[in-house]
């Protein structure tokens, strides 16, 4: 089975490379997941996303867990997913009404 | 216990080709990417290029673009460098070393370098 | 390309003292910088990641701070084996340059 996911192999300083232009097939029976690397800098925040096998985006994202503090200076969050493009922006939040 | 060892190095002529081996073991290069780092004798560390074994996605530094080719032979656990139009100012010690691609991570093991002499 | 300039470009010290090496990155590179030792005719050994994190094995009289532009690499109390060349790389962007060394010699 084949995933897309979104990939963007330089930081992009506030873009999250989570457009159409972005999406590449990966390769099959190997990258089995999406990995997104989100690291916040004093310049702002930057991104990192590519096809991953499972077992080097587990390795990451396990090794690396205690560098993850969301919305501090210097956190890097590394995430790994399975579903088609779900390295791609996070979902908007519905307004209650 | 995880061990990189390059091997190919040699004396070549300016305009030839070499190709250079990091076999690893201890480990799956699947998992990390390789990065190819060269030292000109009594001089500082140039990344050369690096790859994701995994997909096969490749970056070189300026000074080797469109000279130099980085494979992977995943069945053999072996990263390649394959050195063409070579130059004298290409004569250094060749190390491969793995990184995990988080961008925290650093080369955590390297091999023990093998010497390419560009020399006619 | 972000330049990652280290200085002294040399030193010379005595055993027991305190060292000290600065890295300073053209731009912000937060706290994707590792620090390595050689010594002549072998590979470089990674000492410090992520800016300040010692690595496996590694003495603990090494210690790296710094992040965003300015990073340093102490050495408290030099032993003798620590007479070698150090590098500071950063691991964020691509190429992931290195400094362009800083040996240190005995004085």
């Known amino acids: 089975l084949q995933i897309q996911c979104y990939q963007c192999e330089e930081f992009q300083l506030n873009n999250d490379c989570s457009s159409p232009e972005f999406i590449v097939n990966c390769t099959v029976n190997v990258q089995d997941m999406c990995q997104k690397e989100v690291m916040e800098q004093s310049a702002g925040i930057m991104y990192r996303k590519s096809c991953a096998s499972s077992a080097a985006c587990l390795i990451a994202s396990a090794g690396y867990q205690s560098f993850c503090s969301p919305g501090k200076l210097n956190s890097v969050c590394i995430s790994c997913c399975n579903t088609p493009l779900c390295n791609g922006p996070r979902p908007k939040k519905r307004g209650s009404s | 216990e995880v061990q990189l060892v390059e091997s190919g190095g040699g004396l070549v002529q300016p305009g030839g080709s070499l190709r250079l081996s990091c076999a690893a073991s201890?480990?799956?290069?699947?998992?990390?990417?390789i990065h190819w780092v060269r030292q000109a004798p009594g001089k500082g560390l140039e990344w050369v290029g690096r790859i994701y074994p995994d997909s096969g996605a490749t970056y070189y530094a300026d000074s080797v673009k469109g000279r130099f080719t980085i494979s992977a032979d995943t069945s053999k656990n072996t990263a390649y460098l394959q050195m063409n139009s070579l130059r004298a100012e290409d004569t250094a010690v060749y190390y491969c070393?793995?990184?995990?691609?988080?961008?925290?991570?650093?080369?955590?093991?390297w091999g023990q370098g093998t010497l390419v002499t560009v020399s006619s | 390309d972000i330049q990652m300039t280290q200085s002294p470009s040399s030193l010379s010290a005595s055993v027991g003292d305190r060292v000290t090496i600065t890295c300073r990155a053209s731009q912000d590179v937060s706290t994707a910088v590792a620090w390595y030792q050689q010594k002549p005719g072998k590979a470089p050994k990674l000492l410090i990641y992520?800016?300040?994190f010692l690595y496996s094995g590694v003495p603990s009289r090494f210690s790296g701070s710094g992040s965003g532009t300015d990073f340093t690499l102490t050495i408290s109390s030099l032993q003798p084996e620590d007479f070698a060349t150090y590098y500071c790389q950063r691991s964020v962007f691509t190429p992931p340059a290195f400094g362009q060394g800083t040996k240190v010699e005995i004085k």
């Open positions: 992520s800016a300040s």
């Open positions: 201890g480990f799956t290069i699947t998992n990390y990417g």
């Open positions: 070393a793995r990184k995990l691609w988080v961008s925290l991570a650093a080369m955590d093991y």
